[in-house]
């Protein structure tokens, strides 16, 4: 009997298995009686990743430097391109087709992890003990100041946005 | 099990005609392109001809093109090569061979049929 | 027309050693390439097919390689029955050709 399923890296045409294009090549013509697939390489900026039946590769995906994109790994025949942010900034998708300015985390808040071309600033509240007093995008929260260990006392308590203000111990007169 | 068995052959004269056969037997013969492949004495192989199962696709080597004709009969598992205006570079040894179901290799062959073209 | 050239012609080796055979095309041929094993007297044999998958009842120590227009044939270790002639084909585009043939013998 004529095939009705085909083997893996194979397809069924005019009830013949012909063989797919291997990774980084299109399909010309399909296989004959005689002949198998006629496949053609991919050209420049061009790509497939699979096997393929397909008569068209794929355009490498373009990195556009106004949408502050910069390449991170060229396409190959096989390989699209990788697209990641220019520093500062990180994609706004798994596909990273734009980027956005890295967050800031404000005052009262530290950078838990710092930003990276495809993720965001992670920002956490300072807990007790800790304070940011400035909108940064690297900075993590600061441990108040110890005035114990400079000889000095608490003259004004910190908070979560501003540090303890130290000052000299009462003398007994 | 799978064979292919050739016959036919013989001496003919320049200029005359001969028509080879090919037997199959053991596999189902019309679910199998076909071809014919030639060795002369001494040489090397060189395909000649091939036909699809249904017999709508046939294909030839230049050097015996408008003067071969290959033809099949699946109800008979039969293949054929009628050869016209013979010349003496037709002398060899004639295969049949089968195309494999699963590739485009050739895998079944007879033991073959010598052909004579010689006055 | 895709032209096939075998080399070496003659291959001069002992049982037990390794057999490395070439074929190159004149254009790409993809992995669209058999090899075939002949003995004197007797009708072709499919060794491989698709450029490196093993014929039925090939055994292990014959293998192929190659894509494009650079194909090998390897026997890793000798047998006395390997020492024959050995012809490549292509069957990316009619016609269907085959190199002109390696002779296998025995130093």
């Known amino acids: 009997e004529p095939p009705t399923a085909c083997r893996e890296k194979q397809y069924l045409i005019n009830s013949q298995c012909c063989s797919l294009c291997q990774p980084g090549q299109k399909l010309v013509s399909d296989c004959t009686e005689f002949t198998e697939t006629e496949c053609l390489p991919c050209g420049e900026s061009e790509f497939l990743d699979t096997w393929n039946r397909e008569t068209h590769c794929h355009q490498h995906k373009y990195c556009d430097p106004n949408l502050g994109l910069r390449v991170q790994q060229k396409g190959t025949s096989e390989t699209d391109t990788i697209c990641t942010c220019e520093e500062g900034w990180h994609c706004t998708s798994e596909a990273c087709e734009s980027c956005v300015l890295h967050r800031s985390c404000s005052p009262g808040f530290g950078v838990k992890q710092i930003a990276t071309g495809v993720s965001d600033t992670i920002c956490e509240p300072c807990p007790v003990g800790f304070f940011s007093n400035v909108s940064s995008a690297f900075e993590k929260c600061h441990p108040w100041t110890s005035c114990e260990t400079k000889d000095l006392v608490v003259q004004q308590a910190g908070t979560n946005k501003t540090d303890v203000v130290c000052g000299p111990q009462d003398r007994l007169r | 099990q799978v064979q292919l068995v050739e016959s036919g052959g013989g001496l003919v004269q320049p200029g005359r005609s001969l028509r080879i056969s090919c037997a199959g037997s053991?596999?189902?013969?019309?679910?199998?392109?076909m071809h014919w492949v030639r060795q002369a004495p001494g040489k090397g192989l060189e395909w000649v001809s091939g036909i699809s199962r249904n017999s709508d696709t046939i294909v030839y080597a230049d050097s015996v093109k408008g003067r071969f004709t290959i033809s099949r009969d699946n109800a008979k598992n039969s293949l054929y090569l009628q050869m016209n205006s013979l010349r003496a570079e037709d002398t060899a040894l004639y295969y049949c061979?089968?195309?494999?179901?699963?590739?485009?290799?050739?895998?079944?062959w007879g033991p073959g049929t010598t052909v004579t073209v010689s006055s | 027309e895709t032209t096939l050239t075998q080399s070496p012609a003659t291959l001069s080796l002992s049982p037990g050693e390794r057999a490395t055979l070439s074929c190159r095309a004149s254009?790409?041929?993809?992995?669209?390439l058999a090899w075939y094993q002949q003995k004197p007297g007797q009708a072709p044999r499919l060794l491989m097919y698709d450029s490196s998958s093993r014929a039925t009842g090939i055994p292990d120590r014959f293998s192929g390689s190659g894509s494009g227009t650079d194909f090998t044939l390897t026997i890793s270790r000798l047998e006395p029955e390997d020492f024959a002639v050995y012809y490549c084909?292509?069957?990316?585009?009619?016609?269907?050709?085959f190199g002109g043939g390696t002779k296998l013998e025995i130093k």
């Open positions: 061979a089968r195309r494999s179901g699963d590739h485009h290799a050739m895998d079944v």
């Open positions: 084909q292509q069957y990316s585009t009619v016609p269907l050709t």
């Open positions: 254009q790409s041929v993809n992995t669209y």
């Open positions: 053991g596999f189902t013969f019309g679910d199998s392109a």
